[in-house]
């Protein structure tokens, strides 16, 4: 008789999830000499231990602590790039500007990027059929709790000037409900972080508005200022040209003042 299985609203665990995590870990540790000491089998065991046999709506940050410990990594605290709703450009940027880091440039972020996973209460099975949706089912699901945990730690590690890339094409350029708005903003440490600098990325070729004046950016400025962190904002009108300037910073069209 087939066992009854909970049907969740979200997509199931990414196929070949264990193999993918293990392969990514091996690849990452080969590329990053400072992480060569990491035992990828132990990393997978700790990752698995965070959600296997647990109810996928009852996951806590504590469940991920063994994984966090194994994935401990030092990134230059003044070279952190946060992002919200504009992951691809943020990643293109750090691929060129190699001394800056998004969360997904760290081991733990790299392992989980674009993946979904969940288990089932009291069985050692991974659920490949469905996983809880953050809105429709529950917020304390394995994926959401993971990103909340690593995002909080990443923000806490930041110092000096922290940059954040925001999507100027969205109706809410700064969204209080995003991971950046709900987790990272509130975990920047005022005693370490001097300035949060927002880069508002324009989508339209002919869009010449100053999106730094957007009401949601003003809201972000207010939140940050209340936390005794300075705020600055820049429009990136042409992201394609911005990336070209990152690649060719010696070009005088990239360095001259407006």
């Amino acid at each position: 008789v087939p066992r009854w299985r909970q049907q969740w609203s979200g997509p199931g665990t990414t196929k070949r999830f264990p193999e993918t995590v293990l392969a990514r870990c091996v690849k990452y540790t080969e590329i990053h000499p400072e992480m060569r000491h990491v035992d990828c089998q132990s990393v997978w065991d700790a990752f698995k231990g965070a959600f296997i046999s647990k109810h996928p709506c009852n996951i806590t940050e504590e469940d991920y602590q063994p994984l966090m410990k194994l994935g401990t990594q030092t990134v230059p605290c003044n070279k952190i790039l946060l992002w919200s709703r504009i992951k691809d450009l943020a990643h293109q940027f750090t691929q060129v500007q190699r001394d800056m880091f998004t969360l997904e440039d760290t081991l733990l972020g790299y392992l989980a990027d674009d993946l979904t996973w969940c288990g089932e209460f009291n069985t050692s099975k991974i659920n490949y059929q469905s996983c809880p949706d953050w809105r429709k089912d529950c917020s304390n699901n394995p994926v959401s709790v993971f990103w909340k945990t690593v995002s909080r730690r990443f923000a806490e590690a930041a110092c000096d000037v922290v940059h954040v890339m925001l999507n100027g094409s969205r109706s809410k350029i700064f969204d209080k409900n995003s991971t950046f708005g709900s987790v990272e903003v509130h975990n920047l440490q005022p005693e370490k972080v001097q300035t949060l600098e927002a880069w508002v990325i324009h989508g339209g070729r002919e869009d010449s508005r100053d999106l730094c004046q957007d009401p949601t950016i003003k809201e972000l400025e207010s939140i940050i200022s209340k936390r005794n962190i300075q705020f600055s904002c820049k429009n990136i009108y042409r992201p394609d040209k911005f990336l070209q300037c990152v690649k060719n910073p010696e070009d005088s069209s990239c360095t001259s003042e407006i």
Partner: nanobody
Framework: EVQLVESGGGLVQAGGSLRLSCAAS????????MGWFRQAPGEERELVAE???????SYADSVKGRFTISRDNAKKTGYLQMNSLKPEDTAVYYC?????????????????WGQGTQVTVSS
């Protein structure tokens, strides 16, 4: 006084090529972004291609792979090589430069304009 003078326009058959030149004077050419625009009768002026001071380029989707923008800072001249021309490329072509302070990825407006050169592509 800043002057931009275009040349190289003319009548060409579809599939043919032309090379436009833009000679600049009165400005430190090597420091300026340079752009080529075109305006067909009854249409708005559109940006065709841009080149930064150091040679980074940007193209309108309609000309990508067919047009090539380049510059010779020593000669204070910009170029637009136009290959595989189509009848819809028919327009007056202008070269232009924004103010010195313009940043490649920022908002900037073109301030200096040439008088234009006619390009006609017959089918």
């Amino acid at each position: 006084e800043v002057q931009l003078v275009e040349s190289g326009g003319g009548l060409v058959q579809a599939g043919g090529s032309l090379r436009l030149s833009c000679a600049a004077s009165g400005l430190t050419f090597s420091s300026y972004i340079m752009g080529w625009f075109r305006q067909a009768p009854g249409e708005e002026r559109e940006l065709v291609a841009e080149i930064s001071s150091g040679g980074m380029t940007s193209y309108a989707d309609s000309v990508k792979g067919r047009f090539t923008i380049s510059r010779d800072n020593a000669k204070k001249t910009g170029y637009l090589q136009m290959n595989s021309l189509k009848p819809e490329d028919t327009a007056v072509y202008y070269c232009a430069a924004p103010e010195r302070g313009s940043i490649w990825y920022s908002r900037y407006e073109y301030k200096y304009w040439g008088q234009g050169t006619q390009v006609t592509v017959s089918s």
